[in-house]
């Protein structure tokens, strides 16, 4: 048994780190492998993560962690029974992938405006809470040529779009993702998309 692609891990800077890797051949990850992890810290214990399959040769493990602080460093050992396949380390604060925003809602009852709101995925006491900026992707299922990214660089998780900039009488979808500039994170996954119908019509005298 051999590791083809070494584990690569990202932290949500809250309670979970996710490690993914590829094996040299088809593997039943949960039955054959264990990822052991231990915080480099006085009297810390070794904890075990049972991986899941992620495609034929891919494995993924969700490591339960405490709140992340910059000093935290973990040792990682990938075992197949009594055989040590790989040994490495992981500093969560240096490999952050934020959680995806949630509760994306479209409000169309605001005059002349489509208002999109979503929730910050972190509690106020988390360091990322006040550091997230967002990208909102809006596209149309009726008009494949229409797809826009709106960068939201302010803290408030909202975006206002003049309804007149969207075609009337067709459906649109939106999704949102986040990143934290000061923590040099990657982008989060996209939130689930939400759909709405743009029924806005310009007043008669503006036509």
């Amino acid at each position: 048994m051999k590791v083809l692609q070494e584990p690569a891990c990202v932290s949500d800077y809250m309670s979970i780190s996710t490690c993914e890797w590829k094996m040299g051949g088809p593997t039943n990850c949960s039955a054959e492998l264990r990822l052991l992890y231990q915080l480099v810290f006085q009297s810390s214990e070794t904890h075990t993560c049972v991986p899941e399959n992620n495609g034929g040769v891919g494995c993924v493990c969700h490591l339960l962690m405490d709140d992340v602080v910059s000093m935290d460093n973990y040792t990682l050992d990938l075992w197949a029974g009594q055989q040590l396949l790989w040994k490495g380390s992981f500093k969560p604060s240096e490999h952050v992938k934020p959680r995806a925003p949630g509760n994306l809602t479209v409000h169309t009852n605001v005059s002349d405006t489509v208002l999109l709101t979503w929730s910050n995925p972190y509690p106020p006491d988390n360091y990322l809470y006040n550091d997230l900026t967002y990208a909102v992707n809006i596209w149309s299922e009726n008009d494949p040529a229409y797809s826009r990214i709106h960068n939201v660089t302010y803290l408030k998780p909202t975006l206002r779009i003049p309804a007149s900039t969207l075609k009337s009488g067709i459906s649109y979808r939106a999704r949102v993702r986040a990143w934290a500039q000061h923590y040099n994170t990657t982008w989060s996954e996209w939130s689930p998309s939400t759909k709405w119908y743009n029924s806005y019509r310009e007043p008669f005298e503006q036509r």
């Epitope: 006085q42 009297s43 810390s44 214990e45 904890h47 602080v69 910059s70």
Partner: antibody, heavy 125, light 112 residues
């Protein structure tokens, strides 16, 4: 009531051995790391050894490494210190102390908040 | 190893007066914001040490509020706002960030 009671001290000749015990009660013993601290006559406090809650992690002062072994039996709520190749400079009162919660991912620390009454070890010919 | 240096080593105090003991570490004991791995212990004559302050500034259960701890990084202070006769004994700072845990030399507090 949370309590630690040491035993096993006594007079031993240089090169001899002693085994100290520390019985814990009133708390979930296996959840906590434990520590031994000693105090030579008229001197300050000196850390000797620590062990994680599971017993997998053990730590020693350079002065006792290779001679002393810390261990625990969580089924008996008891901590041990096996002392071999004793020297005159090991003469001290030995205290066991309750250390951090080690079952969490990052051990939670609240100080060495409970100490035993101490057991005296005298190494002399 | 982290060296803990205490001062003064002897501290005569009049009852009712404040007292202050300093402890300096040879390297930072700050692990993360608010978590300085330094404790203060009091050992009264013929007794086991007892915990006063943990993680720099947290008072242990049952410790009178006249005791307080402060500082961050390498410099720490234990303050007694009004010394009482029962406070006599040896005071030790200790770092537990990493093994070996190390203690200060001890400060003997006595009543004038």
């Amino acid at each position: 009531e949370v309590q630690l009671v040491e035993s096993g001290g006594g007079l031993e000749q240089p090169g001899g051995s002693l085994r100290l015990s520390c019985a814990g009660s009133g708390f979930t013993f296996r959840d906590f790391a434990m520590t031994w601290v000693r105090q030579a006559p008229g001197k300050g406090l000196e850390w000797v050894s620590s062990i994680s809650g599971s017993g997998d992690g053990t730590y020693y002062a350079d002065s006792v490494k290779g001679r002393f072994t810390i261990s625990r039996d969580n089924s008996k709520n008891t901590l041990y210190l096996q002392m071999n190749s004793l020297r005159a400079e090991d003469t001290a009162v030995y205290y066991c102390a309750k250390d951090r919660v080690s079952i969490t991912i990052r051990p939670r620390y609240y100080g060495l908040d409970v100490w035993g009454q101490g057991t005296t070890v005298t190494v002399s010919s | 190893d982290i060296v803990m240096t205490q001062s003064p080593l002897s501290l005569p105090v009049t009852p009712g007066e404040p007292a202050s003991i300093s402890c300096t570490a040879s390297q930072s004991l700050l692990y993360s914001i608010g978590y300085n791995y330094v404790d203060w212990y009091l050992q009264k004559s013929g007794q086991s040490p007892q915990l006063l302050i943990y993680l720099g500034n947290n008072r242990a259960t049952g410790v009178p509020d006249r005791f307080s701890g402060s500082g961050s990084g390498t410099d720490f202070t234990l303050k007694i706002s009004r010394v009482e006769a029962e406070d006599v004994g040896f005071y030790y700072c200790m770092q537990s960030l990493q093994t070996p845990y190390t203690f200060g030399q001890g400060t003997k507090l006595e009543i004038k």
